[in-house]
Amino acid sequence: SGVFQLQLQEFINERGVLASGRPCEPGCRTFFRVCLKHFQAVVSPGPCTFGTVSTPVLGTNSFAVRDDSSGGGRNPLQLPFNFTWPGTFSLIIEAWHAPGDDLRPEALPPDALISKIAIQGSLAVGQNWLLDEQTSTLTRLRYSYRVICSDNYYGDNCSRLCKKRNDHFGHYVCQPDGNLSCLPGWTGEYCQQPICLSGCHEQNGYCSKPAECLCRPGWQGRLCNECIPHNGCRHGTCSTPWQCTCDEGWGGLFCDQDLNYCTHHSPCKNGATCSNSGQRSYTCTCRPGYTGVDCELELSECDSNPCRNGGSCKDQEDGYHCLCPPGYYGLHCEHSTLSCADSPCFNGGSCRERNQGANYACECPPNFTGSNCEKKVDRCTSNPCANGGQCLNRGPSRMCRCRPGFTGTYCELHVSDCARNPCAHGGTCHDLENGLMCTCPAGFSGRRCEVRTSIDACASSPCFNRATCYTDLSTDTFVCNCPYGFVGSRCEFPVGLPPSFPW
């Protein structure tokens, strides 16, 4: 659809005569009839297949034609067409004399014709005017013409209909050739697909308007490139949705079981060395001078009774010092200046001479010890506490403080590791010499049956079109992560490509 426009510029008829040569009375009141038709090698009479138009009287004899496009569109003359412009045409322009006011063909005598010109040729659609001048014996006509497309029609022959729009069926303007030019932020054949936020993950994100990034199930973050870990995951991460891969030192289904109590809690005091020995379990190796489960107790070096022969022990900053009784000397009062004649043996001990009387030895009755039978027997010296238990003197008796995992008077009994019900998900616990073993029910595995291997919802390969399947462990269901171009809960639907333009 378009318009053939003809702009009449000047008509010269100096002698004011008709085509017959007869003069007009009083002058030639001139109007024009225009016939536009298909291309003819020799322009001949016949139907004006592309249209006709007539002007009112524009002047007398010779005159210039005013541009009157604003005042009703009389000049340029408009010859609209509702077909594809063929690129060629024939044009007939007749100048007529109007003796009266009736300009209808049937109201005019045939000899009222002043001049007739006929041209034909090629004409491309465009904004530029073609200027032409046709001269006959008595008249001259100067005019210009062009073909332009009607509103919303585009292309070389005005055949492409395109209407700019900015709604959900398209966001575009029209290019000169009729193709669409998408508005900023939109793409697709009809410019109806928004361009998501730059960097928005192609598979895991989408958008409904430009510069947006909405996440598909299992993904989060500004660009939908961060997976959502399994619900309840405490000290773990994921590389695909609903995973819970434990950080170092953590275990269990939700990574909430502390396997590195030493690092996370630093329980050992006074520079002791900490060793992890199981979930929330540890052992402290104390530095000299310290004791207790967490090495929190400072040991007196005199507690080991290092002074012999009744010497008294004094604690010092850098150790201890023995004050020896008369007749003894040495670091631990171990050297004697006494003999049996001095009755050195206490508590009923009997004395025996040694080295020709230069030395002696005391034989102590039960419950006494020491080189002079001066000490009551320390019931802990025989290390009666098994399995690393700590022996404590309590007057005439003794008791053992046991390490975790042991019990009994002498810590000789191994506490059942199974007592804490360590096996998850109904696993059966077996005590072993060095720990325990869990026998897991169907669907669970791991040292403590903490790994769910039950219904792998992805085992049946429910996702189509090479989608990635993730098992949601909390619900035993699956989530399909679709590749680009597919949607649906199983990625079973291709995102349809719209058909081509219906030109």
């Epitope: 209407k163 900015n166 697709g188 109806q192 989408y206 949607v487 649906g488 639907f493 349809g496 719209p498």
Partner: antibody, heavy 121, light 104 residues
Framework: EVQLQESGPGLVKPSETLSLTCTVS??????????WGWIRQPPGKGLEWIGD???????YYNPSLKNRVTISVDTSKNQFSLKLSSVTAADTAVYYC?????????????WGQGTLVTVSS | SYELTQPPSVSVSPGQTASITCSGD??????VSWYQQKPGQSPVLVIY???NRPSGIPERFSGSNSGDTATLTISGTQAMDEADYYC?????????FGSGTKVT
């Protein structure tokens, strides 16, 4: 060939919510080439566009109904739904679901057979 | 709100041409669709984007749109063409239907 089928109660009490579902068969609702719309026609009167939605859930509503209407999509079931709240007798109409094609400038090339919803106590 | 106006009825003799108009402000700058609806049936798209016919629609149906008026023309009208006809356009994000024309 794509087919659309409306379903839902034929009688709704005044002030309640009208709920209809359109099931799409013979084609995927998850195509960027189409919007899925609801149109109604009161007895003996003309057509009125209610609103539409695409597979991603972008919705557009008739301003005259916007405060009362909600359209949603379920791509896994290949369905889309209409909810119209606070209904009155004026909402009595045949309700159609239709497919609006982007390539046809928004023309609705497939329609359901329509379901009559009467609002009455 | 945007409105599309249609004549309530148009009468035509079989074999003659029926023209149904649809007018709206600057309608020529919008794409117009036309729907045919027979009694008790769902509407059927007969023209889209002003002038295009969907497959299966007879050639006797044609459309045009310029200025403020779109026209649906049925040339060589047949008895089976008796129906209600609705024009439809999009104003911003809203679908707008004409009031409908009964062709007898």
């Amino acid at each position: 060939e794509v087919q659309l089928q409306e379903s839902g109660p034929g009688l709704v009490k005044p002030s309640e919510t009208l709920s209809l579902t359109c099931t799409v068969s013979g084609g995927s609702i998850s195509s960027s080439s189409y919007y899925w719309g609801w149109i109604r026609q009161p007895p003996g009167k003309g057509l009125e566009w209610i609103g539409d939605i695409n597979y991603a859930g972008s919705t557009y509503y008739n301003p005259s109904l916007k405060n009362r209407v909600t359209i949603s999509v379920d791509t896994s079931k290949n369905q889309f739904s209409l909810k119209l709240s606070s209904v009155t007798a004026a909402d009595t109409a045949v309700y159609y679901c239709a497919r609006e094609a982007v390539a046809l400038g928004g023309g609705a090339d497939s329609w359901g057979q329509g379901t009559l919803v009467t609002v009455s106590s | 709100s945007y409105e599309l106006t249609q004549p309530p009825s148009v009468s035509v003799s079989p074999g003659q041409t029926a023209s149904i108009t649809c007018s709206g402000d600057m309608l020529g700058d919008k794409y117009v669709s036309w729907y045919q609806q027979k009694p008790g049936q769902s509407p059927v798209l007969v023209i889209y984007e002003d002038t295009n016919r969907p497959s299966g629609i007879p050639e006797r149906f044609s459309g045009s749109n310029s200025g403020d008026t779109a026209t649906l023309t049925i040339s060589g009208t047949q008895a089976m063409d008796e129906a209600d006809y609705y024009c439809q356009a999009w104003d911003s994000e809203t679908g707008v239907f004409g009031s409908g024309t009964k062709v007898t």
